[in-house]
């Protein structure tokens, strides 16, 4: 490529978090060049002895590439040329965390970032009024979550109070012995307020808010996840 | 300081089993692929088996393949090599040492431990 | 797997001499071989890496060549102290071949 070696481009990489069993990304940007053929995207994991991704000359070079990313991997491949390198990870693993590398080498120079790719599992709750029970109960599930997350009730109308004594969470395992199913129950529920399960982990919070009247129930779920600028 | 001490070596019958391990300490343990080395006496050096930092990815010698399992305990900074159907043939002197941090980057086997010996006889 | 072949199995020499040890592998190996020494009931100790990097505390007497298939450790002036067996490794590929050593022996 014709490159002296003194000069360095910038790479910019945004720490992330992946949910085991889905599709993830780690992003990574840089300064393009004009010429894809001239551009190499080199992806490398911390204490792992082979490659993750290797992009050159316009196509991916996978000779070095470490097993457990085997057919897992990909890059935009149409996007490389305007500085986009982001991978695309498939069917994302626990053992998958870890630091990263993304390395670019174009003819303008060399540059490298590192990113912490966390991964776990985490699902949006969904709260209910639970019919079944013998007092106004709400019933707050989420189907997948890794590692053990806390659960937390809040009112709107008791803001600041705790809800540890009236309320009950259990965490089952799923069948592929990793993630567990959330579940908490909020017992004594009065009518008119507006309720939150807060479920959250080092990876992920998410919130589940129901308001009930007497005329209606109204849901809300939101997931947010932490130590992520995406 | 780097530090490497493996334990767990001994004498062992064929067909026998024996866990090694190596305490590690001076440096961040997860940050590096570790591996297996061995020397049968008076002959050369052979790399038995390595693991990656976080646990994920195993690689062995065709020689040990479905017989050693390598593995980590990251909170532990100790790695294990449990081998089993121990042959005649697996005498040696078994060092662990620090493998890569970075593929392509950095040193490897910068760093072993004094070796523990491991005889497979009846 | 990828096959390492040294050469000489071993050689004498004098305090003061040039000393050149190659190394072969059966498939390209980048430039991703490193270099051993061993004395006896000592752990080996590495001298180069990436095929001519020099690994820090080591003197500059050592030097390593080669990418591909052909490498060679060469010691510009023997001294006392380097009268040990030498060992060449690939690390191109998931294992890590060594070489079955060069035995370096006062002359």
């Known amino acids: 490529f014709g490159i002296s070696g003194r000069h360095s481009i910038t790479v910019t990489t945004v720490a992330s978090a992946g949910n085991i069993g889905e599709d993830g990304i780690l992003s990574c940007t840089f300064e393009p060049d004009i010429k894809l053929s001239d551009i190499v995207i080199q992806w490398l994991k911390e204490g792992v002895l082979g490659l993750v991704h290797e992009f050159k000359e316009g196509k991916d070079e996978l000779s070095e590439q470490d097993e457990m990313f085997r057919g897992r991997t990909a890059v935009f491949a149409d996007q490389v040329i305007v500085g986009n390198a982001s991978l695309r990870l498939k069917n994302v693993q626990l053992t998958d965390a870890g630091t990263y590398k993304c390395y670019i080498i174009t003819s303008k120079g060399k540059g490298n970032a590192n990113l912490e790719y966390k991964t776990g599992a985490f699902s949006m709750p969904e709260v209910n009024v639970d019919y079944n029970a013998s007092s106004e109960t709400l019933r707050c599930e989420a189907p997948r979550w890794f590692p053990q997350p806390t659960v937390v009730w809040a009112s709107q109308v008791d803001q600041g109070a705790n809800f540890s004594e009236v309320s009950n969470t259990s965490f089952e395992l799923n069948s592929e012995n990793v993630t567990m199913k959330v579940v908490s129950v909020l017992y004594n529920v009065t009518i008119n307020n507006t309720y939150s399960c807060m479920i959250e982990n080092d990876i992920a919070k998410a919130t589940g808010d129901i308001k009930v009247t007497e005329s209606e129930i109204k849901r809300r779920s939101h997931l947010q996840l932490l130590n992520s600028k995406a | 300081e780097v530090q490497l001490l493996e334990s767990g070596g001994g004498l062992v019958q064929p067909g026998g089993s024996l866990r090694l391990s190596c305490a590690a300490s001076g440096f961040t343990f997860s940050s590096y692929a570790m591996s297996w080395v061995r020397q049968a006496p008076g002959k050369g050096l052979e790399w038995v088996s390595a693991?990656?930092?976080?646990?994920?990815?195993?690689y062995y010698a065709d020689s040990v393949k479905g017989r050693f399992t390598i593995s980590r305990d990251n909170s532990k900074n100790t790695l294990y090599l449990q081998m089993n159907s121990l042959r005649a043939e697996d005498t040696a002197v078994y060092y662990c040492?620090?493998?890569?941090?970075?593929?392509?980057?950095?040193?490897?086997?910068?760093?072993w431990g004094q070796g523990t010996l491991v005889t497979v006889s009846s | 797997d990828i096959q390492m072949t040294q050469s000489p199995s071993s050689l004498s020499a004098s305090v003061g001499d040039r000393v050149t040890i190659t190394c072969r592998a059966s498939q390209s190996t980048r430039s991703w071989l490193a270099w051993y020494q061993q004395k006896p009931g000592k752990a080996p100790k590495l001298l180069i890496y990436?095929?001519?990097s020099l690994e820090g505390g080591v003197p500059s007497r050592f030097s390593g060549s080669g990418s591909g298939t052909d490498f060679t450790l060469t010691i510009s002036s023997l001294q006392p102290e380097d009268f040990a067996t030498y060992y060449c490794q690939q690390y191109g590929s998931y294992s890590r071949t060594f070489g079955q050593g060069t035995k370096v022996e006062i002359k």
């Open positions: 990436k095929a001519s």
């Open positions: 693991i990656s930092g976080g646990g994920g990815s195993t």
């Open positions: 040492a620090r493998d890569i941090q970075w593929y392509g980057e950095s040193t490897l086997f910068d760093y």
